[in-house]
Structure formats: C-alpha cells, structure tokens
C-alpha cells in the first residue's frame, strides 16, 4: 500500500513539476527590468527565452521574437536546450510512469517490469529536474553578471556627449517557477525510485507461505527444489503464487516452521 502511495505521489509531484517546467520555459518573464535606483522609464521591459516584451504605462504590451538563431548568446541557447531536454525527458518519464503505476493493470505485466519502468521514469524525472534547475541557474548567473556589469556603467557614452539608457535586468517570475518546478520533478523522481525498490521482486520470495500454512503437501519441481519454499530462481513462476497486492509486512515475511516438511 505504501509503495503504491509513494509511486502515485511521485507521479503527481513529477507531473506538477513538469507542468511547471513547461510553463517556465514558455513564460516571458525570465528577466525583468530592474526598477530600483534606475532612470524611471515610461516603459517596462521583460524578456523570456523566446521573445522580449515591453509594457507601456497604458497597459499596451508588445513582444518581439528572437528571430535569429545564430545571433543569440551561446548561454541563452544552452538554457533553451537544457529546458527542452528537461521537458522531453519529463514527458517520456510521465508516459513510462503511467504504465508503471501499480494501480493501473495492463494485460499480464509483471511487477518486475513495472519496477523497471518505475525506476526508468524516476531516473528520467531526476535528470529532467536537474536540467531545469541547471537551465534556470545558468540564466540567473548570466543575469547577475550582466547586472553588475551594467551597474558599473549605468550609462554608456556615445560620442562623448550623448548618453544611452542602460536597462538593468533582474530575476523574473519564470526563474522562481523553474527552480520550484525543477525541484518538484527531482523529488518526484526520487519518490519513484524509492517506490521501485518496493515493487521489485526480491531474490527470496516468501509469499507462498500463506498458501501452505494449513497443509503439508509438497509440490516438487524437477531438480528436487521445493516450489513452495520459494528458494532458487522462482521469478518465472511468481504469478502462480501472487495472491494480489502485498502489504509491507508480506514483503518482510520470514520462513516459518510450516515452510519445511
């Protein structure tokens, strides 16, 4: 039950995280004009990964896309790449984890397969979250660097006499959305990996115990190994003894006196 809950919660947390990563990637407010100790401009500038926008005091907002690919800073391209990789991995992870969910039955999929899928999706979520956090952090670092550079030179001289306003940018809402979303995806991935441990069939499976507690009839397999004991490699026969959902106690069961004739 706890495994199912952990897996389900991991899936939901990752889903929210990936939705957040997508939202952050699409948001225009990655960097916003710093209004503190700056010349008071009648317009408000903010920038995203894909376009820059200007909001005039009337509320009129105009956005212009970055229509060049080669002319963009390498760092911005790197951030775009990290965010896209994060989204793609997260989306694949979600798809995989849907089929891995214990509460969803798909044909005769074994628990081992579900465990593997849960682990795969968990790893994907972790990498996805890390990509998002890395992308946002790289952008934030770029902002901090540019901020102090423009603070050192608030106005850049042009021809000695003419001055041009140096717009300083600070952290936009998208950065915080990205950090939180990346963190959630990462946490969701870890939860999926933890759930995988509970789903994975152990080397010694004592689930058959409850079926043989009342009687002492022993079924022999070719080669002299007792099928009922669960010793040996019995994963192929596992479904025969699977009575349904296990509790935590069942996973931890130990041999009883009834296991031996």
């Amino acid at each position: 039950m706890a495994v199912t809950a952990c897996q389900g919660l991991g899936f939901v947390v990752s889903l929210i995280g990936i939705a957040g990563i997508i939202a952050a990637t699409c948001m225009d407010q990655w960097s916003t004009q710093d209004l503190y100790n700056n010349p008071v401009t009648a317009v408000f500038n903010y920038q995203g990964l894909w376009r820059s926008c200007v909001r005039e005091s009337s509320g009129f907002t105009e956005c212009r896309g970055y229509f060049t690919l080669l002319g963009l800073p390498a760092m911005l391209q790197a951030v775009r790449a990290l965010m896209i990789v994060g989204i793609v991995l997260g989306a694949i992870g979600l798809l995989v984890s849907i089929f891995a969910l214990k509460c969803i039955r798909i044909g005769s999929m074994e628990d081992s397969a579900k465990a593997n899928m849960t682990l795969t999706s968990g790893i994907m979520f972790i990498v996805s979250g890390l990509c998002a956090i890395a992308g946002v952090s790289v952008f934030a670092n770029m902002l901090v660097t540019n901020f102090w550079m423009s603070t050192a030179n608030m106005y850049t001289g042009m021809g000695g006499m003419v001055q041009t306003v140096q717009t300083r940018y600070t952290f936009g809402a998208a950065l915080f959305v990205g950090w939180v979303a990346g963190g959630l995806t990462l946490i969701g991935g870890v939860m999926m990996c933890i759930a995988c441990r509970g789903l994975a069939p152990e080397e010694t499976n004592y689930k058959a115990v409850s079926y043989h507690a009342s009687g002492h009839s022993v079924a022999y397999k070719p080669g002299g190994f007792k099928a009922s004991t669960g010793f040996g490699s019995n994963t192929k026969n596992k479904k025969i003894y699977d009575g349904g959902a296990r509790t935590e106690d069942e996973v931890q069961s130990y041999p009883s006196k009834h296991d031996y004739v």
Epitope: V43, N45, V54, E56, S57, G59, E62, Q163, V165, T167
Partner: antibody, heavy 119, light 113 residues
Framework: EVQLVESGGGLVQPGGSLRLSCAVS????????MHWVRQAPGKGLEWVAY????????YYADSVKGRFTVSRDNAKNSLYLQMNSLRAEDTAVYYC????????????WGQGTLVTVSS | DIVMTQSPDSLAVSLGERVTMNCKSS????????????LTWYQQKPGQPPKLLIY???TRESGVPDRFSGSGSGTDFTLTISSVQAEDVAVYYC?????????FGQGTKLEIK
C-alpha cells in the same frame, strides 16, 4: 467623443494654493493614465505631472516636486492637481491630458485653465 | 533630465514646399526591448491646445494627413511636411516620452511666406 474640461484656475497670490479639476467624458477614465501639462504665456510646453490609471505610479517635474500633488477619482471621472506654495513662475495655462494607448503619447488635450500667480 | 533641442526655432516656407524640422535629445530614446523610439511630435495652432501628430517617432496618429512623416532613431529625429498647406501654420513640439520627467523641445514655429 472624448472630452476633458479643466476648471479651478484663477488669480492667486504667491505662496497661495489652488486646486485644479479636470472632468472627463467619452472614454473609460479608469483605464488611462493622465497628465498635467502647462504653458506659460507666449512660451513652450512644460510637462508637470503624471498619474497612472490605478494611481500606482505618480511622477512630477522637478520644478513642482514637493509643491504639487496629482490625484484622481475614477468613480467621479475626475483628475485633480493640488498646487501649494505657488510662485510667479507657475503662471500658465494648465492642460489636462490623456495618456494614449500607444507609444506613451499624450493623445487628447483639454482646452486648458489659466492660473495667474501675482501679488 | 533629458534635454530636447529643436532646430530651427522658426522657419518660413512657401505653400506646397517641403519642410523638415529637427529634434535632438541628450539621451537615446530608443528602447531595445521593442526596437522603438519613444519620441512624440505635436502641433499647436494659435489659440488651441496641442494636437498629437506622431508617436514612436514615425507612427502617424489616426486622422493626421499623410503629408506629415516622422523619422530618426536614438537621439536624432526629424518631422517632415512633404507639401506645406496654409493650415499647417503652427508651432511643432517634440517630446521625450521615454524617461521621466517627460520633457518637451522648445518648439519650431512654422510660418508661410
């Protein structure tokens, strides 16, 4: 039709106070920022103050800062300019102006009200 | 504060003639975010309040005759009247609408010869 009608102008002694009003009609007043611009007799235009639609942003010209206060009452479709510590150089025609939707332009102007500061 | 300087102070032209007047700002009025220049031109006829002609340095306000055109970027701007009409007699002002306090040029007076 957009209309801006200023009132409250007149003769006042130096150091005195005056409150100008601007009654607005023909557009959704609460959606637009508003400016006060003045023009001394025979002189050019001088921007005085700006108030945003929701009164979040208020800016003044250095020459009036600390003496003039701009305010608005969106429910009454009215703009105000409270002028204190008036000086002779404040003598001018005061225009109430709407801030345009595009390009920060000042698109609609009232006819103006004359303020004379003299002893 | 941004200082706006207009030239010439006045000019007299014949009807139908092409006229240009200049406006120079002490700081750039160009906003890189939307690639626009925040400069506005106004026309003030005698005894009337000013009228908006051009915003964003080159965009004509609706209802303004197409003989009026604006150009320039950064710090240097020009208002051109391609063929002067009698009703164009007025004082023309440029205004910085980019940085507060907003500032006007001293004006250029247009007269007919």
């Amino acid at each position: 039709e957009v209309q801006l009608v200023e009132s409250g102008g007149g003769l006042v002694q130096p150091g005195g106070s005056l409150r100008l009003s601007c009654a607005v009609s023909g557009f959704t007043f609460s959606s637009f920022g508003m400016h006060w611009v003045r023009q001394a007799p025979g002189k050019g235009l001088e921007w005085v103050a700006y108030i945003s639609s929701g009164t979040t942003n208020i800016y003044y010209a250095d020459s009036v800062k600390g003496r003039f206060t701009v305010s608005r009452d969106n429910a009454k479709n009215s703009l105000y300019l409270q002028m204190n510590s008036l000086r002779a150089e404040d003598t001018a025609v005061y225009y109430c102006v709407r801030s345009g939707y595009y390009g920060q332009s000042l698109d609609y102007w009232g006819q103006g009200t004359l303020v004379t500061v003299s002893s | 504060d941004i200082v706006m300087t207009q030239s010439p102070d006045s000019l007299a032209v014949s009807l139908g003639e092409r006229v240009t007047m200049n406006c120079k700002s002490s700081q750039s009025l160009f906003n890189s975010g939307n690639q626009r220049n925040y400069l506005t031109w106004y026309q003030q006829k005698p005894g009337q309040p000013p009228k908006l002609l051009i915003y964003w340095a080159s965009t004509r306000e609706s209802g303004v005759p197409d003989r009026f055109s604006g150009s320039g970027s950064g710090t240097d701007f020009t208002l051109t009247i391609s063929s002067v009409q009698a009703e164009d007699v007025a004082v023309y002002y440029c205004q910085n609408v980019y940085i507060y306090p907003l500032t006007f040029g001293q004006g250029t007076k247009l007269e007919i010869k």
